[in-house]
């Protein structure tokens, strides 16, 4: 006899990175017929939802109208069909951004490089933080961590055209509270210099569409919640 139901999927809309004072919805998708969903935050019960009618609904939403550092952290959800509970979902790391200050991002040896050149990003923030995060915009949120007193180096090593794209960095005050994003830095990697076509292989977006990027990133992954779950889950490990 089955003791538990399959674990639900958990994700955040529009994104797991939420600017402070902005809204976010945590989604939990289980099975049709689930009579109760529980959202847990940092290991404790945070909210309950009982869908009506349960046989027509397999997803619930927990709305956070005003994101702040107290709401940032690890979320998971479970659901119940009759008396049988599911396994807990993977952990969702919900991050509050736009805290305190804005770092500056620079790229060495410059924004235009040749395939094979060694590239390093530098993220600098003069306030009290020792962890930095470098993100490449695009369909998947590639995140690297770096450490340093006021700046961190992110060596990409010899680059290929796959490194083309727009990068931003954040200072991290703790795992779930990040600074404002830096201004974007666009890296152009030329494979064959004779052919200076610079169309990036990952979709990238202009400086003023960071919000759109976040939405696009999430939308792209909504089709596969497992992938998004995995991305979010591994982001801060």
């Amino acid at each position: 006899q089955q003791q538990t139901l399959p674990k639900p999927f958990i994700w955040a809309e529009p994104h797991f990175m939420v600017p402070k004072e902005k809204q976010v919805t945590i989604c939990c998708q289980g099975n049709y017929g689930a009579v109760e969903y529980q959202l847990h935050f940092e290991g404790s019960l945070f909210a309950v939802d009982r869908p009506k009618p349960p046989e027509r609904i397999n997803k619930v939403q927990f709305y956070i109208p005003d994101m702040n550092s107290r709401m940032a952290g690890q979320y998971s959800c479970i659901y119940r069909v009759g008396e049988l509970w599911s396994e807990p979902s993977n952990l969702l790391d919900l991050v509050v951004t736009e805290m305190y200050d804005t770092p500056t991002l620079s790229v060495h040896p410059g924004p235009e490089v040749i395939s094979g050149e060694k590239v390093t990003f530098y993220c600098r923030l003069d306030t009290a933080t020792s962890m930095f995060l470098l993100l490449k915009e695009g369909r998947s949120s590639h995140v690297q961590r770096g450490y340093g007193k006021v700046q961190a180096e992110f060596p990409l090593g010899p680059v290929t055209t796959a490194h083309r794209g727009t990068y931003r960095c954040f200072g991290s005050y703790n795992n779930h509270a990040w600074s404002f994003p830096s201004e974007p830095v666009k890296l152009l990697v030329t494979g064959d210099i004779e052919n200076t076509s610079l169309a990036p292989e990952d979709p990238t977006f202009p400086a003023d569409t960071w919000g759109t990027y976040l939405l696009t990133t999430e939308t792209g992954l909504q089709k596969d919640h497992a992938l998004w779950d995995h991305t979010a889950q591994n982001l801060l490990r």
Partner: antibody, heavy 117, light 107 residues
């Protein structure tokens, strides 16, 4: 067009310091690394170091770490290099140069530093 | 640091000549080799980057070749305005390093 303007010459006494300037125009000053290079008569160029104006990150040649200090003034798009405890070995032409694309593609005219009592 | 060696410190040639200047690196620099021209008045210009790519505005009589540790700059039809000192520079590893220069004179 891209321009890097440097004063022509500086005469300084041994043991003193000198601050060389390089005023940039024609490109986004904060986005590109400013390099400084030394050229002594009859010798090759020596790379001193570089600075990125956006956040002041620097890389130095180990040989010049105690000799040169690189700074920038973003408001005037000017880069500076201070040379300290000058000796006759520091008499040289000093160039500022930037990499806009794939190499050091724009150079200043150079400042000739003469260290003499 | 990577050592860059230009074995010929000076070179005499006639106008119209084909001139080749060589440069050797102390280790493989993966084609990240640039050539610069310093005119007698001190002006410095980039000629060639990434071994063989002509910088914009540089006459096509200049060309570069090489791989691994050995590189060369060729001027196919020497003109009066080419009288200068030529330096190679590796951009593969920090710190960037330069050759000692080859001074080109007219016979």
């Amino acid at each position: 067009q891209v321009q890097l303007q440097q004063p022509g010459a500086e005469l300084v006494k041994p043991g003193a310091s000198v601050k060389l300037s390089c005023k940039a125009s024609g490109y986004t000053f904060t986005s590109y690394w400013m390099h400084w290079v030394k050229l002594r008569p009859g010798q090759g160029f020596e790379w001193i170091g570089e600075i990125i104006p956006s956040n002041g990150v620097t890389n130095y040649n180990e040989k010049f770490k105690r000799k040169a200090t690189l700074t920038v003034d973003k408001s005037s798009s000017t880069a500076y290099m201070q040379l300290s405890s000058l000796t006759s070995e520091d008499s040289a032409v000093y160039y500022c140069t930037i990499r806009l694309r794939y190499a050091l593609d724009y150079w200043g005219q150079g400042t000739s530093v003469t260290v003499s009592a | 640091d990577i050592q860059m060696t230009q074995t010929t410190s000076s070179l005499s040639a006639s106008l119209g000549d084909r001139v080749t200047i060589s440069c050797r690196a102390s280790q493989d620099i993966s084609n990240f080799l640039n050539w610069y021209q310093q005119k007698p008045d001190g002006t410095v210009k980039l000629l060639i980057y990434y071994t063989s790519r002509l910088h914009s505005g540089v006459p096509s009589r200049f060309s570069g070749s090489g791989s691994g540790t050995d590189y060369s700059l060729t001027i196919s039809n020497l003109e009066q305005e080419d009288i200068a000192t030529y330096f190679c520079q590796q951009g593969n590893t920090l710190p960037p390093t330069f050759g000692g220069g080859t001074k080109l004179e007219i016979k």
